[in-house]
Amino acid sequence: SASSRRRQQSRNRSTQSQDVARVSSASDYNSSELKTACRKHELYVSFQDLGWQDWIIAPKGYAANYCDGECSFPLNAHMNATNHAIVQTLVHLMNPEYVPKPCCAPTKLNAISVLYFDDNSNVILKKYRNMVVRACGCH
Amino acid sequence: SASSRRRQQSRNRSTQSQDVARVSSASDYNSSELKTACRKHELYVSFQDLGWQDWIIAPKGYAANYCDGECSFPLNAHMNATNHAIVQTLVHLMNPEYVPKPCCAPTKLNAISVLYFDDNSNVILKKYRNMVVRACGCH
């Protein structure tokens, strides 16, 4: 019956929420076979390499990290995907030329404290928000 | 003097915060000449197209929208870039093969209410968070 069919579909949704779209695309991995899933990558940034050594006193650099990787169907739990990202993934499967995959972006960012010279050559200690990537997800 | 040079650099930072890196790379527009800047794009999603019409009663679809576009140097104010995204853009300029550009992702998401059948065919009204893209930015 329609009622039991709905129950079955709903159960499928709970256990593998994205299988509803599996029927629509055989393979979306054409250009991403070598790519890993969205995750945090380690990155140390030297302020000298950015050309900022003359105004930033300390630190000399910091562990900024970055996010990279695929947000491909199906989005696993560890990808910290928003509801919109899940919907967008399904729409991308149907219309890859029109709608991109969700992108791998920071979900948690930390601040760092920087000692620097201001316009008047005063030494300032300032906390800069959203400087360090702590976690990544599909957005 | 070093002091006046710092003042000048600091002034440059204030007025055009990313010019500090302009000295290091002439062009990063190798693969993005035709792409527009990161922004919100309109997208209506039909639940029937997702194969969800049997369990979602209402609405029939909704304006989900999505984010797309380049997060290239220099990141303008309207790109809602985080401090980390600004740093990442500069690192990408120097090492494009190692660090990607920041990605264009939702910065504001809204909820929608959905009327649907649960596992037991009960009709449920539920608010789903982070379903609609209201604004995009470089992250």
């Epitope: 991403s32 790519k35 390499d49 | 000295v23 290091s24 790379s25 120097m94 090492n95 093969e97």
Partner: antibody, heavy 118, light 108 residues
Framework: EVQLVESGGGLVQPGGSLRLSCAAS????????MSWVRQAPGKGLEWVSA????????YYTDSVKGRFTMSRDNSKNTLYLQMNSLRAEDTAVYYC???????????WGQGTLVTVSS | EIVLTQSPGTLSLSPGEGATLSCRAS???????LAWYQQKPGQAPRLLIY???SRATGIPDRFSGSGSGTDFTLTISRLEPEDFVVYYC?????????FGGGTKVEIK
């Protein structure tokens, strides 16, 4: 010891295609970006293309965009340059080179000669 | 695109003499991303200097680099017979990676 060995060069007619390979050894290939650089006979060095460690991002000099495709097979520690619609001005020795993060090209392969002539 | 101009095109000197090779950028570049290479006939280029002034592994101390902004210099303090080859500067801070046209150091 880090080693890069190019192969696949040869004589090809204008409009033809050629695929160059670069076999890498002595380092964790997938962790490094790689580039192709060419040198026309008696001329200077010209960067051609670059690829990220995963192969996900590629970059090209303007004169080869749409004609050349750079790729890599990390399971085989091999770099490739697929060259289509070849022109006389593509005649050169093609070198592959490793580019560590924040660093210049080091080392380079010995090069392979590509001659485009009718 | 950053254009690198090397001068002179050819430098005629005698063994034991010092050589000064110039590399000028079309716009200011970070010294962190300026390199020098040596190329012997029939061989691949070899990295000499990176970060404008740091010697690569195994490079003799007669080779030194300096400069900032738009003007960079490679100095060879005392020319040995094997130094009479071609030298290139390179900007490697982002694509396109550009090379200078080269300076040939020849025996006078």
């Amino acid at each position: 010891e880090v080693q890069l060995v190019e192969s696949g060069g040869g004589l090809v007619q204008p409009g033809g295609s050629l695929r160059l390979s670069c076999a890498a050894s002595g380092f964790t290939f997938s962790s490094y970006a790689m580039s192709w650089v060419r040198q026309a006979p008696g001329k200077g060095l010209e960067w051609v293309s670059a690829i990220s460690g995963s192969g996900g991002r590629t970059y090209y000099t303007d004169s080869v965009k749409g004609r050349f495709t750079m790729s890599r097979d990390n399971s085989k520690n091999t770099l490739y340059l697929q060259m289509n619609s070849l022109r006389a001005e593509d005649t050169a020795v093609y070198y592959c080179a490793k580019r560590p993060y924040n660093s210049p090209f080091d080392p380079w392969g010995q090069g392979t000669l590509v001659t485009v002539s009718s | 695109e950053i254009v690198l101009t090397q001068s002179p095109g050819t430098l005629s000197l005698s063994p034991g003499e010092g050589a000064t090779l110039s590399c000028r950028a079309s716009q200011s570049v970070s010294s962190s991303y300026l390199a020098w290479y040596q190329q012997k006939p029939g061989q691949a280029p070899r990295l000499l200097i990176y970060g404008a002034s740091s010697r690569a592994t195994g490079i003799p101390d007669r080779f030194s680099g300096s400069g900032s902004g738009t003007d960079f210099t490679l100095t060879i303090s005392r020319l040995e017979p094997e130094d009479f080859v071609v030298y290139y500067c390179q900007h490697f801070g982002g694509t396109p990676f550009t090379f200078g046209g080269g300076t040939k150091v020849e025996i006078k």
